[in-house]
């Protein structure tokens, strides 16, 4: 008798979330910084929520959070939450340091 092959698809809530920062976690003021919420999820994440160090939700819901021009006041810890049809997951905190530059201060 011929055997049938079955594929079992496992659905799971977002996991292993992390915030990556480009060009890095230390950015000179006036430049741009992009925070990306990376995750493993099935089905893929359908909705992202971003939070700052006060656990205040930010008005951004895409996978990438772009800050341009970045300001020293943007410095702090950020985390993201990913949601799919199965559930939610959250990342650890990642710290962004936006630093003063003598050049930009001199142009003020």
């Amino acid at each position: 008798t011929a055997s049938k092959a079955w594929t079992l698809e496992v659905l799971y809530a977002p996991r292993r979330l992390r915030v990556s920062m480009s060009p890095g976690d230390q950015v000179m003021e006036g430049k741009s910084a992009t925070l990306t919420c990376e995750s493993d999820a099935n089905p893929p994440v359908s909705h992202y929520t971003w939070f700052d160090w006060n656990n205040q939700s930010l008005p951004y819901h895409s996978q990438k959070l772009r800050l341009e021009p970045v300001k020293v006041q943007h410095s702090g810890a950020y985390w993201c939450q990913g949601t799919n049809s199965v559930g939610k997951g959250r990342s650890p905190l990642s710290t962004l340091t936006v630093y003063y530059s003598p050049e930009t201060i001199g142009r003020r």
Epitope: Q26, T95, T97
Partner: nanobody, 121 residues
Framework: QVQLVESGGGLVQAGGSLRLSCAAS????????MYWYRQAPGKQRELVAT???????NYADSVKGRFTISRDNAKSIAYLQMDSLKPEDTAVYYC???????????????WGQGTQVTVSS
């Protein structure tokens, strides 16, 4: 309490050199952006040089090509090598450190004595 202690200042003739040190007491020194500032009598504090954890550096136009900022993460020290010194470099020099939104010294704080650099002509 985290401390920053500057040293290495002194009296030097124009054209001479000095190396300033900023010794920091935080265990995670390598994660901090480090700054050197200076304040001349009757003037506002001025940012001179910046170095990131990854040794990216930036300088004020007035010191470019003459001053070099560096760091030794193993010793938790930031340096300012000052060459071709000019009388207008005379000031008290201070360091500062930043991680995220935390500055070890805030602008309203008493920044202490710093280290005095005097350049005579």
């Amino acid at each position: 309490q985290v401390q920053l202690v500057e040293s290495g200042g002194g009296l030097v003739q124009a054209g001479g050199s000095l190396r300033l040190s900023c010794a920091a007491s935080m265990s995670s020194f390598s994660q901090y952006v480090m700054y050197w500032y200076r304040q001349a009598p009757g003037k506002q504090r001025e940012l001179v040089a910046t170095i990131t954890s990854y040794s990216n550096t930036n300088y004020a136009d007035s010191v470019k090509g003459r001053f070099t900022i560096s760091r030794d993460n193993a010793k938790s020290i930031a340096y300012l090598q000052m060459d071709s010194l000019k009388p207008e470099d005379t000031a008290v020099y201070y360091c500062n450190a930043q991680y995220g939104s935390t500055f070890i010294r805030n602008h309203w704080d008493d920044w202490g004595q710093g280290t005095q650099v005097t350049v005579s002509s």
